[in-house]
Amino acid sequence: ILGGREAEAHARPYMASVQVNGEHLCGGVLVAEQWVLSAAHCLEDAADGKVQVLLGAHSLSQPEPSKRLYDVLRAVPHPDSRPDTIDHDLLLLQLSEKATLGPAVRPLPWQRVDRDVEPGTLCDVAGWGIVSHAGRRPDRLQHVLLPVLDRATCNRRTHHDGAITQRMMCAESNRRDSCKGDSGGPLVCGGVLEGVVTSGSRVCGNRKKPGIYTRVASYAAWIDSVLA
């Protein structure tokens, strides 16, 4: 997260760290007791490593009573996701067992009504992604509030030049932005999960390259079918 600040500890109990061989790779969001939603491209970066999900964490390194690392029983990328595009960049991870719920671990309600968030709405994005252009990684969870950007502006040639489909949404990126390592994490508007950070090689913090988020409401049928 660029231009953000440290989150209040455990105030986002849905927040997950998707890890490979014990290292944070991507963000994720607990959407059901045994399921974490993340970004499909995160799996590509995992190669053949052991994928696990950390729940109940604020610090990645320090011991915390609520922290628990779960093995992944099943990884289900969206069937239409492709390595060369950010389309359908969603991944569902089934935990090896149901998460132990509590004040620091709780699923987040996700948007099912397929309607665009009003431009200008302030939404919260959180993650353990880099906090500087130099690539400094935080130990503790960071967050930032970002205004939603209308799709027409996001589709301008100097922004994302028509690449933003109706299944995506954008947020402003003027110094405050999601960045590398935040992919798969939640964009939360009004206490509801609206978007998932896409995992492209996008430049961060440049206002002409807004953050791109996969709209979960557009994938309600797929999410329901996997969770069923």
């Epitope: 209308d150 027409a152 589709n155 301008r156 040639r157 100097t158 028509g162 002409k208």
Partner: antibody, heavy 116, light 112 residues
Framework: EVQLQQSGPELVKPGASVKISCKAS????????KNWMRQRHGESLEWIGD????????NYNQKFKGKATLTVDKSSSTAYMELRSLTSEDSAVYFC?????????WGHGTLVTVSA | DVLMTQTPLSLPVSLGDQASISCRSS???????????LEWYLQKPGQSPNLLIY???NRFSGVPDRFSGSGSGTDFTLKISRVEAEDLGVYYC?????????FGGGTKLEIK
């Protein structure tokens, strides 16, 4: 299929105004800016301005400020350009184009002829 | 405004020949975001322009690979490796990095 259907040719008198339209189909109208260009006979293209269909915010080439006014009607997925105080210099083909990707989609053009 | 100067004004070619069109901008057209918004359009008689190349060298979908774009800073080139009859028309370069966006004066590709 993306289509931009422009209104038909206009013959107008000097000093008058004209409003030409560009109706979009095959995509969600509010997802892309609409741009307008002018092409005088045998000449190159000039960018007039663009408009955000969500809120009607328009940007103009300084050269066309006071000459062109861009508007949209979301309910009919139509962009409009009004040209006022017309002179023979304004006789040209006017194109609308969708921005994104680049100017990949254009209307067929509207010929405006200013003549007494 | 950024002036886009195209040469030549007219380019007579034989079918099957290679054609090369030059476009020079009066200032650098590298955008503040790092990208260069230089595009090439082909306008056939009585038609609207068609996008061929965007961001200097990227072919738009459906554009044959005989079209290629290159260049940087202020100097750009469009090459057609083997001219076909359907390639005839007026070619325009365009910069979208600075406001107002501007087109070159055009190069007419015609049969020799």
């Amino acid at each position: 299929e993306v289509q931009l259907q422009q209104s038909g040719p206009e013959l107008v008198k000097p000093g008058a105004s004209v409003k030409i339209s560009c109706k979009a189909s095959g995509y969600t109208f509010t997802d892309y800016y609409k741009n307008w260009m002018r092409q005088r006979h045998g000449e190159s293209l000039e960018w007039i301005g663009d408009i955000n269909p969500n809120n009607g915010d328009a940007n103009y080439n300084q050269k066309f400020k006071g000459k062109a006014t861009l508007t949209v009607d979301k309910s009919s997925s139509t962009a409009y350009m009004e040209l006022r105080s017309l002179t023979s210099e304004d006789s040209a083909v006017y194109f609308c184009a969708r921005e994104g990707p680049s100017f990949a989609y254009w209307g067929h053009g509207t010929l405006v002829t200013v003549s007494a | 405004d950024v002036l886009m100067t195209q040469t030549p004004l007219s380019l007579p070619v034989s079918l099957g020949d290679q054609a090369s069109i030059s476009c020079r901008s009066s200032q650098t057209i590298v955008h503040s975001n790092g990208d260069t918004y230089l595009e090439w359009y082909l306008q056939k008689p009585g038609q609207s322009p068609n996008l061929l190349i965007y961001k200097v060298s990227n072919r738009f979908s459906g554009v044959p690979d005989r079209f290629s774009g290159s260049g940087s800073g202020t100097d750009f080139t469009l090459k057609i490796s083997r001219v076909e009859a359907e390639d005839l028309g007026v070619y325009y370069c365009f910069q979208g990095s600075h406001v107002p966006p501007t087109f070159g004066g055009g190069t007419k590709l015609e049969i020799k």
